[in-house]
């Protein structure tokens, strides 16, 4: 019997995702992997693919936390300067950024059914103890990039070594033994991101290797090129790697939502979260799990599927208008996506020129509001938040690289959907 569309959902790491929902997966030993995008497809499959960062054409690219790829500051015009990810050196072997490998002798308390899984990320080596599944066959095999050996055909996650190496999870089947999450769930705004899958993008092969892992404790340590061991922070019995954030768990109070701690090498730095003094609504509400009060999404003049209060706020975050213009001439399509900001009062326009599905030209311009008002053909398509715009621009950087070398039909249209703010199911953000 065919599953009704409305009932289709995806299960991934004990979490339900709606069809079309996008997120970055949480994978041990890395944590939240911003360089992998997952999407829940219409048939209930989880499709994940690795982000390919474009060469950044500026002198000093900026690494923005929670974004995978480096960005040019203030849409700097191009300079011919290629940026490449740092490789790692460990035990005399050089590993490329994103490469997974196995290490020996790192953990003294390693159990016989555990192995040490390491990965290279931006010049740092991240290693973790991985509990391997019980083997029920005589001749286990090694799988790419996993330190655990598995029985042929085992595992609920099947690998398709096709053109794009997409990794999938079967529809509506819970990955019951997926990685145990010892860290707090990041807020949805940080988890929802990325874009739809691209057959041409290489996936993080083996990133979801061990689908039958028991929920053993994962210890994460970082080793940089100077072989400094143990660059981690330990808080309340949990281990956090450099750059990771969490809300502290204090015995007397439980999880303190209004304090955010970050692991800085081995030192935890905690900051109080400051809530706004004034809210764009009369009666902001306190919601469990959130530090600050939130405005209940009052329905103002709405764009389809969106809820804003009367000052253009969505879930307490300011929204800005997004315009689009599509122009076709001589077999060439020029698509312009524009974001209007108040501070400064200007419009950022992203221009795509595509011929026969191949990206010919992509650039970003900033113009004054006065100039933008002169321009015809721009239609208001939605309002979005700065955080969604950041996700959009990151995705745009990826597909601008990808679509310049192969045919892209709907990638940009799919990406624009990231800007649409959906009304949250349970009435809160």
């Amino acid at each position: 019997e065919q599953v009704k569309h409305s009932e289709t959902y995806c299960m991934f790491q004990d979490k339900k995702y709606r069809v079309g929902e996008r997120w970055h997966p949480y994978l041990e030993p890395y944590g939240l992997v911003y360089c992998v995008n997952c999407i829940c497809s219409e048939n209930g499959n989880v499709l994940c693919s690795r982000v390919r960062c474009p060469n950044v054409h500026c002198l000093s690219p900026v690494h923005i936390p929670h974004l995978c790829c480096p960005r040019c500051p203030d849409s700097l015009p191009p300079v011919n300067n290629k940026v490449t990810s740092k490789s790692c050196e460990y035990n005399g072997t050089t590993y490329q950024h994103g490469e997974l490998f196995v290490a020996e002798g790192l953990f003294q308390n390693r159990q016989p059914n555990q192995c040490t899984q390491c990965s290279c990320s931006e010049g740092n080596v991240y290693c973790g103890l991985k509990t391997c599944p019980k083997l029920t066959c005589a001749f286990p095999v090694s799988v790419p990039d996993s330190c655990c050996r598995v029985c042929r055909g085992d595992g609920e996650l099947s690998w398709e070594h096709s053109d794009g190496d997409i990794f999938r999870q079967p529809a509506n089947r819970e990955a019951r033994h997926s990685y145990h999450r010892s860290h707090y769930d990041p807020p949805p705004s940080r988890q929802a991101g990325g874009l739809s899958r691209f057959p041409g993008a290489r996936s993080h092969r083996g990133a979801l290797m061990d689908s039958q892992q028991a929920s053993g404790t994962i210890v994460q340590i970082v080793i940089n090129n100077k072989h400094k061991h143990g660059q981690v922070c330990v808080s309340n019995g949990k281990t956090y790697s450099h750059g990771e954030s969490w809300h502290p768990n204090l015995r007397a109070f439980g999880i303190v939502e209004c304090v955010l701690c970050t692991c800085n090498v081995t030192k935890q730095e905690c900051k109080k979260i400051h809530c706004p003094n004034r809210y764009p609504c009369k009666y902001p509400q306190k919601i469990d799990g959130k530090c600050c009060k939130v405005c209940p999404g009052k329905k103002a003049k709405e764009l389809p599927g969106q809820s804003f209060d009367n000052k253009g706020y969505f879930c307490g975050e300011e929204t800005m208008p997004v315009y689009e213009s599509v122009f076709m001439e001589d077999g060439e399509t020029t698509r312009k996506i524009a974001l209007e900001t108040e501070r400064p009062p200007q419009v950022e326009v992203h221009v795509w020129t595509i011929r026969k599905g191949i990206l010919q030209h992509f650039h970003i311009e900033k113009i004054s509001k006065r100039m933008f008002e002169e321009l015809p053909h721009f239609k208001l398509v939605t309002r979005t938040t700065l955080s969604q715009w950041k996700i959009f621009t990151e995705g745009e950087a990826q597909i601008s690289q990808m679509c310049s070398s192969r045919v892209c039909r709907t990638e940009l249209e799919d990406l624009v959907k990231v800007l649409y703010l959906e009304r949250s199911e349970k009435g809160h953000c």
Partner: antibody, heavy 121, light 107 residues
């Protein structure tokens, strides 16, 4: 190839009006902004205004709002600029210029040869 | 309107020399800047747009750079045919405004 053709000279009396033309060829006339630029002898360049040939909507620099009127004739792919109440201050070279389509900022990639307007009695 | 201050007003350079012309905007123009070349008795020609993008057919000895309110154009080996007046133009706000021009002559 893209061409913007303008008459070389116009001689008119003070107080009169003149209609300068700019005939476009080699591209889709209605797809690109057309701008008009003034250059007085030995001086800099000033944009007078621009027109969207598709809709006929024109925008003017404040300074030229009561001086210039921009129009188009789509059938002949021609842009026009009418200058009224002419004085010696209006004696200048007037250029029509097209702006690039894949940029929103106005970058003038093709220019006419210019019409030298002389206002003299 | 945004004011564009161009300098120098004129200069003379020998063949092979490097020439730099600068332009200052009265406010941030976020890279929306173009450079035009106008030879005696001719109409202007677009050389560089969006701060540093060379228009098709423009020799690679021409280059542009800058950000915020400060921009410049460089000719890295002056040629006799580069004798002309050069104008910068901001395209960030309306109306687009030009600099007063720099007259470049051959020494």
């Amino acid at each position: 190839q893209v061409q913007l053709q303008q008459p070389g000279t116009e001689l008119v009396k003070p107080g009169a009006s003149v209609k300068l033309s700019c005939k476009a060829s080699g591209y889709t006339f209605t797809s690109y902004w057309m701008h008009w630029v003034k250059q007085r002898p030995g001086q800099g360049l000033e944009r007078i205004g621009n027109i969207n040939p598709s809709s006929g909507v024109a925008n003017y620099n404040e300074k030229f709002k009561n001086k210039a009127t921009l129009t188009v004739d789509k059938s002949s792919s021609t842009a026009y600029m009418q200058l009224s109440s002419l004085t010696s201050e209006d004696s200048a070279v007037y250029y029509c210029a097209r702006s690039k389509s894949n940029y929103v900022a106005y970058y003038f990639d093709y220019w006419g040869q210019g019409t030298t307007l002389t206002v003299s009695s | 309107d945004i004011q564009m201050t161009q300098s120098p007003a004129s200069l003379a350079a020998s063949v092979g020399e490097t020439v730099t012309i600068t332009c200052r905007a009265s406010e941030n123009i976020y890279y929306s800047l173009a450079w035009y070349q106008q030879k005696q008795g001719k109409s202007p020609q677009l050389l560089i747009y969006h701060t540093n993008t060379l228009e098709d057919g423009v020799p690679s000895r021409f280059s542009g750079s800058g950000s915020g309110t400060q921009y410049s154009m460089q000719i890295n080996t002056m040629q006799p045919e580069d004798t002309a007046t050069y104008f910068c133009k901001q395209a960030y706000d309306v109306p687009p405004t030009f600099g007063a021009g720099t007259k470049l002559e051959l020494k």
